[in-house]
């Protein structure tokens, strides 16, 4: 790499993948290794992710561009930019500080991440239960009482004494 | 670079806002910027992260939760630190770092500023 | 939390020397750990990252190794720019509840 020429700022002319090197009378030196620069003009090379562990590579490191990480199969990401990877756990199930725990009854999670989360309660909107709720699945809403042929019974759940539950992260 | 400001003398129980500008590199960017401190003579305290992506994510160091907190404003490229309840144990040069490696590791810094919490 | 542990916390070493400075981890964080090297009145300057990675600008006579919980600076030949305080620091973003980010206590490399 040539040594750069501007009249202005000598680093200005440092492209993409270089750094502008002060102890070598500011020539443009590439990036070293796990390391880049996404903009011209650096005098520092940024330092590429690594996807270790439960993390997983999506992109790698070029030297004019950072790393993007995912997790690997049984976790999801969380955070920015993927940050962290958290547990993945079955539907019906939540996350705590000692793994994976069925959801209480009264509660649900139709995903493998998050919290479980209180039934609705159909009484609420003046509606009765149609279909009955279960750790995987909310209950289904139909009509309310008073819409219902005489003799047809409903099953409306008391709500759940519970404050929903918190995952740990 | 990163430059910090802000800094100045403040009562025990006061408050005061740091701020870091950015140049030469986008806050869109997907960047980590931290504030890290030193007080007279001592070492170096990692006290909050943000992330200066899209999603802003927070962390505290437990010596900075419930006082102080971390934000961003994108279009003016500038991180703030607004300490609350402030006391004697909080002087210390307050510096900016960045990170792009997800792991605390600051290629970046600032020049710093210094706070001094005395009566 | 994370806690490293820097020694020793000060050395006294002559132009030329090899020098080491050590840093432990309290629990493994593989290899998530950089050294830092600072002057009075001046903010720190990054010379290794991911235990062993030389960052740009830095001259090679810094080296860094180890992983787990054990990690060494060395500096092959000290130089009269050379004495400063070291610092390590170790890492990585788990949750808002249970973030770890420590430094260790620092390392004064001063003139024998």
């Known amino acids: 790499f040539e040594r750069t020429r501007s009249l202005q700022d000598p680093c200005s002319n440092c492209p993409a993948g270089t750094f502008c090197d002060n102890n070598r009378n500011q020539i443009c030196s590439p990036c070293p290794p796990n390391s880049f620069s996404s903009a011209g003009g650096q005098r520092t090379c940024d330092i590429c992710r690594q996807c270790k562990g439960v993390f997983r590579t999506r992109k790698e490191c070029s030297s004019t561009s950072n790393a993007e990480c995912d997790c690997t199969p049984g976790f999801h990401c969380l955070g920015a930019g993927c940050s962290m990877c958290e547990q993945d756990c079955k539907q019906g199930q939540e996350l705590t500080k000692k793994g994976c725990k069925d959801c209480c009854f009264g509660t649900f999670n139709d995903q493998k991440r998050g919290i479980c989360r209180p039934w609705t309660n159909c009484s609420l909107d003046g509606k009765s239960v149609l279909v009955n709720g279960t750790k995987e699945r909310d209950v289904v809403c139909g009509p309310s009482p008073a819409d219902l042929s005489p003799g047809a019974s409903s099953v409306t759940p008391p709500a759940p004494a519970r404050e929903p539950g918190h995952s740990p992260q | 670079s990163l430059v910090e400001s802000g800094g100045g003398l403040v009562q025990p129980g006061g408050s005061l806002r740091l701020s870091c500008a950015a140049s030469?590199?986008?806050?869109?960017?997907?960047?980590?910027i931290c504030w890290v401190r030193q007080a007279p003579g001592k070492g170096l305290e990692w006290i909050a992260c943000?992330?200066?992506?899209?999603?802003?994510?927070?962390y505290y160091a437990s010596s900075a939760k419930g006082r102080f907190t971390i934000s961003r404003d994108n279009s003016k490229n500038t991180l703030y630190l607004q300490m609350n309840s402030l006391r004697a144990e909080d002087t210390a040069v307050y510096y900016c770092?960045?990170?792009?490696?997800?792991?605390?590791?600051?290629?970046?810094w600032g020049q710093g500023t210094l706070v001094t919490v005395s009566s | 939390a994370l806690v490293m542990t820097q020694s020793p916390s000060t050395l006294s070493a002559s132009v030329g020397d090899r020098v080491t400075i050590n840093c432990q981890a309290s629990?493994?964080?593989?290899?998530?750990l950089a050294w830092y090297q600072q002057k009075p009145g001046k903010a720190p300057k990054l010379l290794i990252f991911?235990?062993?990675d030389l960052a740009s600008g830095v001259p090679s006579r810094f080296s860094g190794s180890g992983s787990g919980t054990e990690f060494t600076l060395t500096i092959s030949s000290l130089q009269p720019d050379d004495f400063a305080t070291y610092y390590c620091?170790?890492?990585?973003?788990?949750?808002?509840?249970?973030?770890?980010?420590?430094f260790g206590g620092g390392t004064k490399v001063e003139i024998k």
């Open positions: 629990e493994d964080i593989d290899t998530y």
């Open positions: 030469g590199f986008s806050f869109s960017s997907n960047y980590w």
């Open positions: 943000i992330y200066v992506g899209s999603s802003g994510d927070t």
């Open positions: 770092a960045r990170d792009s490696s997800s792991y605390y590791m600051f290629n970046l």
């Open positions: 620091q170790g890492g990585y973003y788990t949750s808002s509840a249970d973030t770890r980010g420590a």
């Open positions: 991911y235990a062993s």
